[in-house]
Amino acid sequence: HTAAQDNCTCPTNKMTVCSPDGPGGRCQCRALGSGVAVDCSTLTSKCLLLKARMSAPKNARTLVRPNEHALVDNDGLYDPDCDPEGRFKARQCNQTSVCWCVNSVGVRRTDKGDLSLRCDELVRTHHILIDLRHRPTAGAFNHSDLDAELRRLFRERYRLHPKFVAAVHYEQPTIQIELRQNTSQKAAGDVDIGDAAYYFERDVKGESLFQGRGGLDLRVRGEPLQVERTLIYYLDEIPPKFSMKRLT
């Protein structure tokens, strides 16, 4: 993560403080909120990004139907606990000693409890369904062109290996992107689907985490693809454990 000595920044994460105090005067960047050193040649973990965000000043369908175990992040923002590698700790608690278990993307997967709540392991989110609605266009996008553009986006911008983009579904105006990545499939150095999905979510909301060019320029055969709504479903390797009270 090098840069000009007088202007040292992190291209992949705006929410950092950088200084040329690394080995040989190289640029070293630390995430806001946690102070953890980040690798600016790849995506920063969602946990560190959420922590940084909380520390920053406030300002016959082809479509997939998520199954009953799919989680949506309804709890919104919170200040998470991250492990030394930047992953979410399995158990998260707030300042009032209310605790809950989360999955690898930091979404709550149990009822809330007290400090006695046990979360034995961090359960991996292995399937993410990104549900988008695009703004009206003159006609529907060509499905194969749309598929190619979105796969290219995830490969180029987020450096997600193409094998983890399982499918792109389209039924105007709804687009669904399926990301799949089992624990056994994820090799060292592979971008996590949860981190890629989070960066994408921030990009389509116009809140890019990247320095430089910033916002997305999504185009299908020259036609702008503008997203007006995003909903993300998370499926875990082990189904979540909620009481019936929550489900009714």
Epitope: H1, T2, A3, A4, D6, N7, C8, T9, C10, P11, T12, C27, C40, S41, R152, L153, E156, R157, F210, Q211, G212, R213, L216, D217, R219, R221, G222, P224
Partner: antibody
């Protein structure tokens, strides 16, 4: 075959302006970022400017910022570089180049150049 | 502006393996071969490790951390040229090049 053909070079006077044109063929021009790169006589390569595929984003090297304008016409598959207030140090061969990674966070990188033109020579002299 | 760092010259006997390094960038690297000034450079590697189809397989690229490496396995006399690396300066969001490495085949 993918080709990039530059034109518009030649002898220029200091303080004047020039307009270089690059005609692209053999690929879907609208799908690629485009660059200008130059090389002064006996010197190394210098990144000059980049434009994204829609033309909504441009970026310039400090040496030409404020004097250069990069633009494109996707319908005609042409790239342009307008350079004003010419100086002797603008002398060199100007190359049009194609970028292979339009979505990348570091898409301005010279490391993505996957096709060069043959170049057009510019001499700034009185 | 920031320039990428590469050795000014390297030499090798025919058949030997040559490695040229490039550091100082914060993104992807490319490698360009120029046999004489004013003649358009030839792309030998782009995006760290992608080799164009018309480039011999003896040329390969890799990246470790913020250092890119061009490897020529079994160098040949016709590989004698100046090799420029190209990359990205994250502080200015601009492209940059190294000053060039002259490869001499003995």
């Amino acid at each position: 075959a993918v080709t990039l053909d530059e034109s518009g070079g030649g002898l220029q006077t200091p303080g004047g302006g020039l307009s270089l044109v690059c005609k692209a063929s053999g690929f879907d021009f609208i799908d690629y970022d485009m660059f200008w790169v130059r090389q002064a006589p006996g010197k190394g390569l210098e990144w000059v400017a980049v434009i994204n595929r829609s033309g909504s984003y441009t970026n310039y090297a400090p040496a030409v910022k404020g004097r250069a304008t990069i633009s494109r016409d996707n319908g005609q598959s042409t790239l342009r570089l307008q350079l004003n207030n010419l100086r002797a140090e603008d002398t060199g061969t100007y190359y049009c180049a194609r970028g292979a990674c339009t979505h990348c966070w570091d898409a301005d990188s010279a490391g993505y150049i996957d096709t060069w033109g043959h170049g057009t020579e510019v001499i700034v002299s009185s | 502006a920031l320039a990428l760092t590469q050795p000014s010259s390297v030499s090798a006997n025919p058949g030997e393996t040559v490695k040229i390094t490039c550091s100082g960038g914060s993104g992807s690297y490319g490698w360009f071969q120029q046999k004489s000034p004013g003649i358009a450079p030839v792309i030998v590697i782009f995006n760290d490790d992608n080799r164009p189809s018309d480039i011999p397989s003896r040329f390969s690229g890799s990246k470790s951390g913020s250092t890119g490496t061009l490897t020529i396995t079994g160098v040949q006399a016709e590989d004698e040229a100046v090799y420029f690396c190209g990359g990205y300066d994250g502080s200015t969001d601009a492209g940059i090049f190294g000053a060039g490495t002259t490869l001499t085949v003995l």
